[in-house]
Interface confidence: low
């Protein structure tokens, strides 16, 4: 595919990535799908600097990121290694809490009102952030 060299309209460029911040809420899977349809992924936080950037833009609102443990171990949607990567969980989190009464535990990660992370029920309709990297090959077929 062709390389993306600039961000789509209404996306914000920061450190060679493009970000889109939702203003409505979706379940994690729907948010994940939304980003994929935009040739992007739910945001993957790889540094404290990126954490601060995203936190600044989303403010004190629960917001999905591209981190989940629906299949067992915690995984970033783009394959970034979770164990060795950046983490910013709230104290005592993730806790896979079952006491919410919604069935099952908590398998999807989100930014909380202070920016730190929490695991929550994936069906909750939170805002979300999409991210796509500049210079990566897009999924569009090449022009012949």
């Amino acid at each position: 595919g062709s390389e993306r060299t600039c961000c789509p309209v209404n996306w914000v460029e920061h450190e060679r990535s493009c970000y889109w911040f939702s203003r409505s809420g979706k379940a994690w899977a729907d948010a994940d799908n939304y980003c994929r349809l935009e040739d992007a992924h739910l945001v993957v936080v790889t540094s404290w600097e990126e954490q601060k950037f995203v936190q600044h833009h989303i403010g004190p609102v629960n917001t999905w990121m591209g981190l989940h443990d629906q299949n067992g171990p915690w995984k970033w949607v783009d394959g970034t290694d979770y164990e060795t990567g950046f983490k910013n969980w709230r104290p005592e989190q993730p806790d896979d809490w079952y006491g919410h009464g919604l069935g099952g535990g908590e398998d999807c990660a989100h930014f909380t009102d202070d920016g730190r992370w929490n695991d929550d029920v994936c069906q909750r309709p939170y805002r979300w952030v999409c991210e796509t990297e500049l210079d990566k090959a897009s999924q569009e077929p090449p022009l012949l």
Partner: antibody, heavy 123, light 110 residues
Framework: QVQLQESGPGLVNPSQTLSLTCGVS??????????WSWIRQHPGKGLEWIGY???????YYNPSLKSRVSISLDTPKNQFSLKLTSVTAADTAVYYC???????????????WGQGTLVTVSS | QSVLTQPPSASGTPGQRVTISCSGS????????VSWYQQLPGTAPKLLIY???HRPSGVPDRFSGSKSGTSASLAISGLQSEDEADYYC???????????FGGGTKLTVL
Amino acid sequence: QVQLQESGPGLVNPSQTLSLTCGVSGGSISSGYYYWSWIRQHPGKGLEWIGYIYYSGSTYYNPSLKSRVSISLDTPKNQFSLKLTSVTAADTAVYYCARDWGGYDSSGWFDPWGQGTLVTVSS
Amino acid sequence: QSVLTQPPSASGTPGQRVTISCSGSSSNIGNNAVSWYQQLPGTAPKLLIYSNDHRPSGVPDRFSGSKSGTSASLAISGLQSEDEADYYCAAWDDSLKGPVFGGGTKLTVL
């Protein structure tokens, strides 16, 4: 403390291009947390957002002006500029530059503002 | 015509409490935060309230903001002669994908 100062011609001929520059002192336009904005106020009327630019060059424009407006950065000079093409008398206004906080639910938190410059479109 | 609707004028006597309203829709005030500006005669607007009810440092606590549904209000208590100015509300608009302003309210201190 960040201060902004607009500069540019006060008189522009109809059908020509209006060009203004906003100099920023006391802070860097390269900050990753602010958007740099242009807003105008027609004589005796309310405020109208023109558009803004992020440090990375991402731009956002008022849909009603999008076809005629362009905002650009000059990072080494710590300034940003507005170009408005094909102007008419309806573009006569006081033009302000301002810093937009640009974060969560906050576009519209303009602070500080330049003192404004009156641009008259007339031959 | 402005996207956000404000009364064109308001008035009060010194010491009184005055409220200025700002009406919008679900695409702006209903879903986003409101800010308020004070524009003294011949000067640039000054940020008075941000995020519905927050005051920047230096703004007297006589000024307060609130939001309910698709409307917002600016209240000024203990009105003073120096409060005579134009007041504007603003909010992000999801449809226009940009910030929008009210038409402004001219406050007269009698």
